[in-house]
């Protein structure tokens, strides 16, 4: 990018530059016509017969440098060929010299600084590439010369440019003084400000464009070269903030449109809102869940919104004494999640009708909650109680939902309690063919013992056909028809209105070898 300090092509009024010395044949300001056929202010000198060593000077007005360290001067000029000038002396030249003089203010006068090299600083002696020629019988032909010179380094507030003619016939058609600067640049969402290079290369810190944030790593920088070009160098740039995506060739961040979102800063574009969510504003980093839908705390911001599951279905119960096996089917609606678990709530009602949450004497296997399989075994049920189990399905967002959790209930009533096992069997009398047995009356919780069943078999005869049963209403029994001197295993169970209790432990008894021993009372 070029910043103009002076462009005579744009001047409409007389330039009124200073000439030295004030003599005939000096530089003269004239109107000219440029390539675009616009009238321009020019300076012409054509003193080709002057005395050798005599110089004509032309000096511009004071030009503020505006922070530039190096200034460029583009000269457009025409020059007559000495050979085409019949009256040109040996002092005719086809070159001129350019100088500059620095000062902190417009202090130059018609006589100062002295019109010579030092104090003026020589920039270059300029030779014409194209000479205007005239041959007999033909029109004059020529082309405009264009030459760009570099001034500097400059340090004072401004400068004058001066032209020294020592015998040329030439016209200075235009002078363009400018400096080069790196234009404001936006790359990788990073804005680098317009920069005037102070040296060969200058590092320039960038700043993120609106709605962008710095990428990890060193802060973005780019190098501005002396020629006004940014050095092509990879930069760690910026990236669009959440809710914004890169646009217009990575030069700006555009807010995500309604119905789209971008959860993180960085590359990537806005995505449509995931299932069961929406964004009603532009620039959304996250889409809001629809009513009744949620995201778990551990769900990514871009995850779909989910809902608690419906209730489990078809609870099946299998009661076995004081144990209960429950199993069920998965809910129809999982809520869109994989983290499905089950939990049970339990209430128990006593035979008298008073109900309360289940006590701590129940055990659940594998547990009452966080079940991943659709079954549970409940142990420790009390007889003649009615149990209500509510089976609920839960997922990662159940805790976020308000309102009742749907459940599937099942009611189970346990049988009344049977008598306990009969133990402490003792042999009151034995003979070679009989055994008399007695036992303590068990404490039946649900009514009196109605009768007993005695189960016995000869030791060593294990088959079902060898087992014999005897019913008795008393807490004693006589086993007849037994083998002489044989061992028998005996078990007893009691029956109440609730049914038979379990058989007690096997009791080991033996018949007598002969009659002579008679009845012998034995303690079991």
């Amino acid at each position: 990018l070029e910043e103009t300090l002076l462009n005579t092509k744009l001047e409409t009024a007389d330039l009124k530059w200073v000439t030295f010395p004030q003599v005939d044949g000096q530089w003269e300001e004239l109107s000219g016509l440029d390539e675009e056929q616009h009238s321009v202010r020019t300076y012409e000198v054509c003193d080709v017969q002057r005395a050798p060593g005599q110089a004509h000077w032309l000096r511009t007005g004071w030009v503020p440098r505006r922070g530039a360290v190096h200034v460029y001067a583009t000269l457009r000029f025409t020059m007559l060929e000495c050979l085409s000038l019949p009256r040109a002396g040996r002092s005719c030249k086809e070159t001129f010299t350019v100088f500059y003089y620095e000062s902190d203010a417009d202090t130059a006068t018609a006589l100062t600084p002295a019109w010579m090299e030092n104090p003026y600083i020589k920039v270059d002696t300029v030779a014409a590439e194209h000479l205007t020629r005239k041959r007999p019988g033909a029109e004059a032909t020529g082309k405009v010369n264009v030459k760009t010179l570099r001034l500097g380094p400059l340090s004072k507030a401004g400068f004058y440019l001066a032209f020294q003619d020592q015998g040329a016939c030439m016209a200075l058609l235009s002078l363009h003084l400018f400096y080069k600067k790196c234009a404001q640049l936006t790359v990788n969402l990073t804005r680098f400000p317009e920069t005037v290079p102070r040296e060969l290369v200058v590092p320039v810190a960038g700043s993120c464009v609106v709605d962008a944030v710095p990428a990890p790593g060193p802060s973005p920088s780019l190098y501005c070269r002396e020629d006004g070009q940014w050095a092509e160098q990879p930069v760690t740039g910026c990236s669009c903030a959440p809710g914004f995506e890169a646009a217009e060739g990575n030069t700006k961040c555009r807010a995500c449109a309604q119905g789209t979102f971008k959860p993180l800063s960085g590359e990537g574009s806005c995505q449509p809102c995931p299932a069961n969510s929406h964004s009603n504003t532009i620039g959304s980093a996250v889409c809001q869940c629809r009513v009744g839908y949620f995201r778990a705390r551990t769900d990514p911001r871009g995850a779909p919104c989910t809902t608690p599951p419906s209730a489990p279905r078809s609870v099946v119960s299998r009661l076995n004494g004081s144990s209960l096996h429950l199993e069920w089917s998965a809910p129809l609606e999982s809520g869109g999640r994989e983290d499905l678990t089950y939990a049970l709530r339990c209430r128990e009602c006593r035979p008298g009708g008073s109900c309360a949450p289940c006590g701590g004497d129940l055990t659940f296997d594998p547990g009452p909650r966080d079940l991943v399989e659709p079954w549970v075994v409940v142990r420790g049920l009390r007889p003649d109680f009615t149990y209500t189990f509510e089976v609920t399905a839960l997922n990662g967002v159940s805790s976020l939902a308000t309102g009742p959790v749907p459940f599937e209930p099942v009611n189970v009533t346990t049988d009344r309690e049977v008598p306990p096992a009969v133990s402490d069997i003792r042999v009151t009398r034995s003979s070679p063919s009989s055994l008399s047995l007695a036992w303590a009356v068990p404490r039946a919780p649900s009514g009196a013992v109605l009768d007993y069943e005695v189960k016995y078999h000869e030791k060593g005869a294990e088959g079902p056909s060898s087992v014999r049963f005897l019913k008795t209403s008393e807490n004693r029994a006589e086993l007849r028809g037994l083998k002489r001197g044989a061992s028998y295993l005996v078990q007893v169970r009691a029956r109440s209105e609730a049914g038979y209790g379990p058989f007690g432990q096997e009791h080991h008894s033996q018949t007598q070898l002969d009659e002579s021993e008679g009845w012998r009372e034995q303690l079991a």
């Epitope: 003269e28 004239l30 109107s31 000219g32 016509l33 440029d34 390539e35 056929q37 020019t42 012409e44 054509c46 080709v48 025409t78 020059m79 007559l80 085409s84 000038l85 019949p86 009256r87 205007t132 005239k134 007999p136 019988g137 029109e139 004059a140 020529g142 405009v144 016939c169 030439m170 016209a171 058609l173």
Partner: antibody, heavy 126, light 106 residues
Framework: QVQLVQSGAEVKKPGSSVKVSCKAS????????ISWVRQAPGQGLEWMGR????????NYAQKFQGRVTITADESTSTAYMELSSLRSEDTAVYYC???????????????????WGQGTLVTVSS | DIQMTQSPSSLSASVGDRVTITCRAS??????LNWYQQKPGKAPKLLIY???ILQSGVPSRFSGSGSGTDFTLTISSLQPEDFATYYC????????FGQGTKVEIK
């Protein structure tokens, strides 16, 4: 503003010559084209020729070739037009005119003439 | 030599009229064409050069156009001081004037 001041009216005999001068005042002279244009009474303009003083040589219209000589003196900033073998039909007002731009200061040399002398009446009569 | 033919040779018009004068070259002269205005007893005055460039100080009601062989001078709204004779001039090769167009009051 440049002024072109021409010499006074002339009365000439047929067959003679006339030399009209045109002095430029104020500024550059050498690199402008100076043209000579004549206008017979009640007639149109007629271009005769042109000189660029710095080059010394002139260009002439075919019609006047051999009869007209245009010269310039850079030291006095004066241009001259001499017409020989005068005839009665050469009776006219003779104008010098300077081009709008020097040969060095125009990209397109249209040789348009924006400065004119006041004119010199030359009468050819026996 | 290049011949320049102007038309019409004369025309009558009223103040405020739009006036058009044409000039035709016998061969291509690009845009090396100039227009002059001359009033009786006066030297010509340059109006337009390079076919269409208005000379400094000339009113903008004057305009020129054309390239190659056909050219036009237009006065958009004739003023009392515009009654004069107008000449075209080619400078492509040597120089030649047209025969002139006299603009008179109607």
């Amino acid at each position: 503003q440049v002024q072109l001041v021409q010499s006074g009216a002339e009365v000439k005999k047929p067959g003679s010559s006339v030399k009209v001068s045109c002095k430029a005042s104020g500024g550059t002279f050498s690199t402008y084209a100076i043209s000579w244009v004549r206008q017979a009474p009640g007639q149109g303009l007629e271009w005769m020729g042109r000189i660029i003083p710095i080059f010394g040589t002139a260009n002439y219209a075919q019609k006047f070739q051999g009869r007209v000589t245009i010269t310039a003196d850079e030291s006095t900033s004066t241009a001259y037009m001499e017409l020989s073998s005068l005839r009665s039909e050469d009776t006219a007002v003779y104008y010098c005119a300077r081009s709008s731009y020097t040969i060095l200061t125009t990209y397109y040399n249209y040789n348009a003439m924006d400065n004119w002398g006041q004119g010199t009446l030359v009468t050819v009569s026996s | 030599d290049i011949q320049m033919t102007q038309s019409p040779s004369s025309l009558s018009a009223s103040v405020g009229d739009r006036v058009t004068i044409t000039c035709r070259a016998s061969q291509n002269i690009n845009n090396f064409l100039n227009w002059y205005q001359q009033k009786p007893g006066k030297a010509p005055k340059l109006l337009i050069y390079g076919s269409s460039i208005l000379q400094s100080g000339v009113p903008s009601r004057f305009s020129g156009s054309g390239s190659g062989t056909d050219f036009t001078l237009t006065i958009s709204s004739l003023q009392p001081e515009d009654f004069a004779t107008y000449y075209c001039q080619q400078t492509h090769s040597q120089s030649t004037f047209g025969q002139g167009t006299k603009v008179e009051i109607k």
